[in-house]
């Protein structure tokens, strides 16, 4: 009955502060509406990074001011988080909810540790 969610253990953000990873879920039912949430866990505190609801077969749409973008293909979601800085290094959990039709299912991934290294400032040129 439990819904399994898989995501990579570790991802290194690019020098531009962009990190991408795949969140894959094994759907126990034939969901038509799915909600995907990215959570950040730090010191046992959990906060929402971004969330999007999508209809199966349609594109994943985050709010305009979201730091996340993504695409969906079947039971797989490709997530991209932008604007990351070194202080954002942490565990990012993919949460999947099958909202419709009933029954509701919840899936929680083990989390992806995203490492962000701030780029060194360019030296002044004479």
């Amino acid at each position: 009955k439990a819904m399994h969610v898989a995501q990579p253990a570790v991802v290194l953000a690019s020098s531009r502060g962009i990190a991408s990873f795949v969140c894959e879920y094994a759907s126990p039912g034939k969901a038509t509406e799915v909600r995907v949430t990215v959570l950040r866990q730090a010191d046992s505190q959990v906060t929402e990074v971004c969330a999007a609801t999508y209809m199966m077969g349609n594109e994943l749409t985050f709010l305009d001011d979201s730091i996340c973008t993504g695409t969906s293909s079947g039971n797989q979601v490709n997530l991209t988080i932008q604007g990351l800085r070194a202080m954002d290094t942490g565990l990012y959990i993919c949460k999947v909810e099958l909202m419709y039709p009933p029954p509701y299912y919840l899936g929680i991934g083990n989390g992806t540790q995203i490492y962000v290294i701030d780029p060194e400032p360019c030296p002044d040129s004479d």
Epitope: K1, A2, M3, P28, L39, T47, E48, Y105, L106, I108
Partner: antibody, heavy 118, light 108 residues
């Protein structure tokens, strides 16, 4: 701090209606799924109904399906439970509860007592 | 519907003793979706453990959870006077959300 305060309980005759409210504060109410859970006198906890963060999805226990309606007003930070065709077996303390980010019911109200009796 | 069965119904122990409470599910529950709650007379339930073994904010480390699949355990390593209460397990991985019938931990 997170606070959930239920109101609207009381004594009502079988077949009548009652509406419970749950006022939320201390968090962004519109971001969280919510539930109602009840507890009959001297008994265990029974999940009653669920509503999604945006109010678009609702689920009910078989025991209340067709009689109870859950709703929310995110502009007022308030959760509701409309109870119709009440029965003696609906007598219980009704709690509203918040779904935490990882799924458990992380905050509960103090409860409001509903007594269905003639 | 996932049915949760708790045992024993009542546990009579003395302060300082170890309490072991069991919760068995009628079908497999992912460990990410099992919680334990404590309820004292006249009070609302309080979240103790989520994800089978993670302690909720402010919960002392004498409370610990374990298990997977269909068998889960809540352990209180050394009972304090304030720990005498009723404990419920719950699964939240699928609807309908279900609770066990509770285990009462009483003073011997």
């Amino acid at each position: 701090q997170v606070q959930l305060v239920e109101s609207g309980g009381g004594v009502v005759q079988p077949g009548r209606s009652l509406r419970l409210s749950c006022a939320a504060s201390g968090f962004t109410f519109s971001s969280y799924h919510m539930h109602w859970v009840r507890q009959a006198p001297g008994k265990g906890l029974e999940w009653v109904t669920f509503i999604s963060y945006d109010g678009n999805h609702k689920y009910y226990a078989d025991s209340v399906k067709g009689r109870f309606t859950i709703s929310r007003d995110n502009s007022k930070n308030t959760l509701y439970l409309q109870m119709n065709s009440l029965r003696a077996e609906d007598t219980a303390i009704y709690y509203c509860a918040r779904t935490g980010w990882l799924g458990p019911f992380d905050y509960w109200g103090q409860g409001t007592l509903v007594t269905v009796s003639s | 519907e996932i049915v949760l069965t708790q045992s024993p119904g009542t546990l009579s122990l003395s302060p300082g003793e170890r309490a072991t409470l069991s919760c068995r599910a009628s079908q497999s529950v992912g460990s990410s979706y099992l919680a334990w709650y404590q309820q004292k007379p006249g009070q609302a339930p309080r979240l103790l453990i989520y994800g089978a073994f993670s302690r909720a904010t402010g919960i002392p480390d004498r409370f610990s959870g374990s298990g997977s699949g269909t068998d889960f355990t809540l352990t209180i390593s050394r009972l304090e006077p304030e720990d005498f209460a009723v404990y419920y397990c719950q699964q939240y991985g699928s609807s309908p959300w279900t609770f066990g019938q509770g285990t009462k931990v009483e003073i011997k």
